[in-house]
């Protein structure tokens, strides 16, 4: 199965895509795109380079690594849970069915917020949205957004997140980087 | 590999409960929501509610809420469905699933579990 | 609620065919939507989520289209292993399923 990589809504998501160019600034076509692998090409395309450059590009995806080198590592900036999903790094190597394919699982945490004193069943008017950042709503009553009578604290600093243990070592297995800025 | 394996077939009374359990294996309950979903006899699909094991917290289609109660055993990787004041129309085959992650569409099921309302 | 509508409740459809599938939502829930299979005596599959990308594994021959209330999945070169019930989920409100479309040889 596809390999997991996980962020916290609000911080940058990095999903690793290497290779090894067959000589210095021999570079082989990558694209990156939302949903899973096709047999050709890339679905939903977010970022392609060619031989020399990166050529496609949309708001909030970058290669922060060296790509003429080979790293083609994707960072998805600021992230939401509608980011969540799979994500293809397609190598484009020449020749008939040589590219080398990779499906990375991207899975977005929901921030945490503190509680506000109110209580749980409340909640039965309407329903937050669900991709936007986790909020939540009466006391013990976790969801994913925030209705318009309910007060949310502000979200943690990601400093204070990077203390949570568990989200320190969700992110130390899965190999995913947290860049912060 | 995931796996949610869901416990055996029931019949029961009108306005009994049951409790039905689903052991997911292959992965930790914790790190995902863990979704109830419904499917009556040649019907389509209904959501009851999912439960954020880490923190107990649930939320349930308002249709459910006063009958349903989803818990969740992180020690044995199970979760758990309570459905009260059964009747008749309550009669189909009940699936726990797991999200992608935090995002309610479900990529893995159980194999599902009929529930048989009968007196 | 949201309720999500599929107004075919039966397709009739031959291999190699090119079928779609609709779903209304009655109100705007943007992408989030997803679209699973359901084959006979067995647990649904997801295909499709937020609109449009495809799940691991999935073949090429299903697409998602669409947002705010219009939806479709479309097979391309219909195959017999897909004959199934095929269900739309939003997920912008608390889950809502719609009803179901059976897909059947003609």
């Known amino acids: 199965s596809e390999v997991e990589y996980r962020a916290e809504v609000g911080q940058n998501a990095y999903l690793p895509c290497f290779y090894t160019p067959a000589a210095p600034g021999n570079l082989v076509p990558v694209c990156w795109g939302k949903g899973a692998c096709p047999v050709f090409e890339c679905g939903n395309v977010v970022l392609r380079t060619d031989e020399r450059d990166v050529n496609y590009w949309t708001s909030r995806y970058w290669l922060n690594g060296d790509f003429r080198k080979g790293d083609v590592s994707l960072t998805i900036e600021n992230v939401t849970l509608a980011d969540s999903g799979i994500y293809c790094c397609r190598i484009q190597i020449p020749g008939i069915m040589n590219d080398e394919k990779f499906n990375l699982k991207l899975v977005i945490k929901p921030a945490k917020v503190t509680p506000a004193p109110t209580r749980q069943r409340d909640f039965t008017a309407a329903f937050p949205r669900m991709l936007t950042t986790r909020g939540h709503g009466p006391a013990e009553t976790q969801t994913l957004g925030s209705l318009p009578d309910i007060n949310l604290t502000q979200i943690s600093t990601l400093a204070n997140e990077l203390r949570d243990s568990r989200l320190a070592n969700d992110l130390r297995d899965s190999g995913a980087t947290i860049r912060i800025g | 590999e995931v796996q949610l394996q869901q416990s055996g077939a029931e019949v029961v009374r009108p306005g009994a409960l049951v409790k039905l359990s689903c052991k997911a294996s292959g992965f930790n309950i914790k790190d995902y929501y863990m979704h109830w979903v419904r499917q009556r006899p040649e019907q389509g699909l209904e959501w009851i509610g999912w439960?954020?094991?880490?923190?107990?917290?649930?939320i349930y289609d308002p249709k459910f809420q006063d009958r349903a109660s989803i818990t969740a055993d992180t020690s044995s990787n199970t979760a758990y469905l309570q459905l009260s004041s059964l009747t008749s129309e309550d009669t189909a085959v009940y699936y726990c699933?797991?999200?992608?992650?935090?995002?309610?569409?479900?990529?893995?099921w159980g194999q599902g579990t009929l529930v048989t309302v009968s007196a | 609620d949201i309720v999500m509508t599929q107004s075919q409740e039966f397709m009739s459809t031959s291999v190699g065919d090119r079928v779609s599938i609709t779903c209304k939502a009655s109100?705007?829930?943007?992408?989030?939507v997803a679209w699973y299979q359901q084959k006979p005596g067995q647990s649904p599959k997801l295909l499709i989520y937020?609109?449009?990308n495809r799940y691991t594994g999935v073949p090429d021959r299903f697409t998602g289209t669409g947002s705010g209330t219009d939806f479709t999945l479309t097979i391309n070169n219909m195959q017999s292993e897909d004959l199934a019930d095929y269900f739309c989920q939003q997920y912008s409100s608390y889950p809502t399923f719609g009803g179901r479309t059976k897909l059947e040889i003609k």
């Open positions: 109100q705007n829930v943007d992408t989030a």
């Open positions: 937020s609109a449009s």
């Open positions: 699933a797991r999200d992608f992650g935090y995002v309610a569409w479900l990529v893995y």
């Open positions: 439960i954020d094991p880490e923190n107990d917290n649930t």
